[in-house]
Amino acid sequence: CKAMHVAQPAVVLASSRGIASFVCEYASPGKATEVRVTVLRQADSQVTEVCAATYMMGNELTFLDDSICTGTSSGNQVNLTIQGLRAMDTGLYICKVELMYPPPYYLGIGNGTQIYVIDPEPCPDSDF
């Protein structure tokens, strides 16, 4: 297993609709034809997998059904979008990239993107 550099933004603020997008960029040492991207969430020293996708050459990542992630790729950049976020989902979202083929296998893990999610205030009842 060889190491690879992965860059991602330090902080992202989710939209009022609970959507957060960020770019995950990896320094590919060669021309990989099969890449696996995994988003991990770290909160309170617990790490959980949010979503993962394997892609080849195309520019749309396909995630498992009911995934909260969508994404596209362009060169060595992956544009990730996480939907349905709520305040309790605030945390560090880490991008993990694996170059699956051809050998050798490379693994890169980003420093994480702190995603802040603020639940929208409910509209006050109107007397009118």
């Epitope: 034809t33 099969e34 394997t54 195309g58 396909t62 995934s67 969508t70 699956m100």
Partner: antibody, heavy 115, light 106 residues
């Protein structure tokens, strides 16, 4: 030019298995997904699954889980799709198609399941 | 699974007509891709990533949309356009196709 050549038509009995091959040429075999799609007579298209020819990574449509197996032979640039426990509803034309965009398709293999 | 519903399922039109086929997704998708299939033939990629024409596809074909609503438009029907059209999503597994729209000569 890119070509996908599939094996010939098959007639099978219910409960049997069928193995369809798809031989690729004209491009780098390990660079693109190979997808399998079937089409029952007079019906629409149904995605069965895909395989990454380099690593052998597979994704299957859960509708076929336990019945479908996709494999590849990189030495001959050939992908195989095996469907087991056949039933009459599996009578269809089976296509292989390459790439994320299903850019190129094989000519199709007619599989008939009949007692 | 993401369901794709095409409308109409059947469409009768004449050469020179402008026709629009709609593809509605049960959940938001990143892109929609369109295929054309003629009887006894394998499907052919027509439009990918919602609006990009595949190589060799005439400019009378166009695609648009986002989220859950997408359309395929043929600006001026030609005799060779009478076929069945399918939309497809690959945002999530399993990849799914619409049920198809059969375009027939009026």
């Amino acid at each position: 030019q890119v070509q996908l050549v599939q094996s010939g038509a098959e007639v099978k009995k219910p409960g049997a298995s069928v193995k369809v091959s798809c031989k690729a040429s004209g491009y780098t075999f390990t660079s693109y997904w190979i997808n399998w799609v079937r089409q029952a007579p007079g019906q629409g298209l149904e995605w069965m699954g895909r395989i990454a020819p380099g690593s052998g990574t597979t994704y299957y449509n859960e509708m076929f889980t336990g019945r479908v197996t996709m494999t590849r032979d990189t030495s001959t640039s050939t992908v195989y799709m095996e469907l087991s426990s056949l039933r009459s509803e599996d009578t269809a034309v089976y296509y292989c198609a390459i790439g994320d965009y299903f850019d190129y398709w094989g000519q199709g293999t007619m599989v008939t399941v009949s007692s | 699974d993401i369901q794709l519903t095409q409308s109409p399922s059947f469409l009768s039109a004449s050469v020179g007509d402008r026709v629009t086929i709609t593809c509605s997704a049960s959940k938001s998708v990143s892109y929609i891709h369109w295929y054309q299939q003629k009887p006894g033939k394998a499907p052919k990629l027509l439009i990918y990533d919602t609006s990009t024409l595949a190589s060799g596809v005439p400019s009378r074909f166009s695609g648009s949309g986002s989220g859950t609503e997408f359309t395929l438009t043929i600006s001026s029907l030609q005799p060779e356009d009478f076929a069945t059209y399918y939309c497809q999503q690959r945002t999530t597994y399993p990849l799914t196709f619409g049920q198809g729209t059969k375009l027939e000569i009026k």
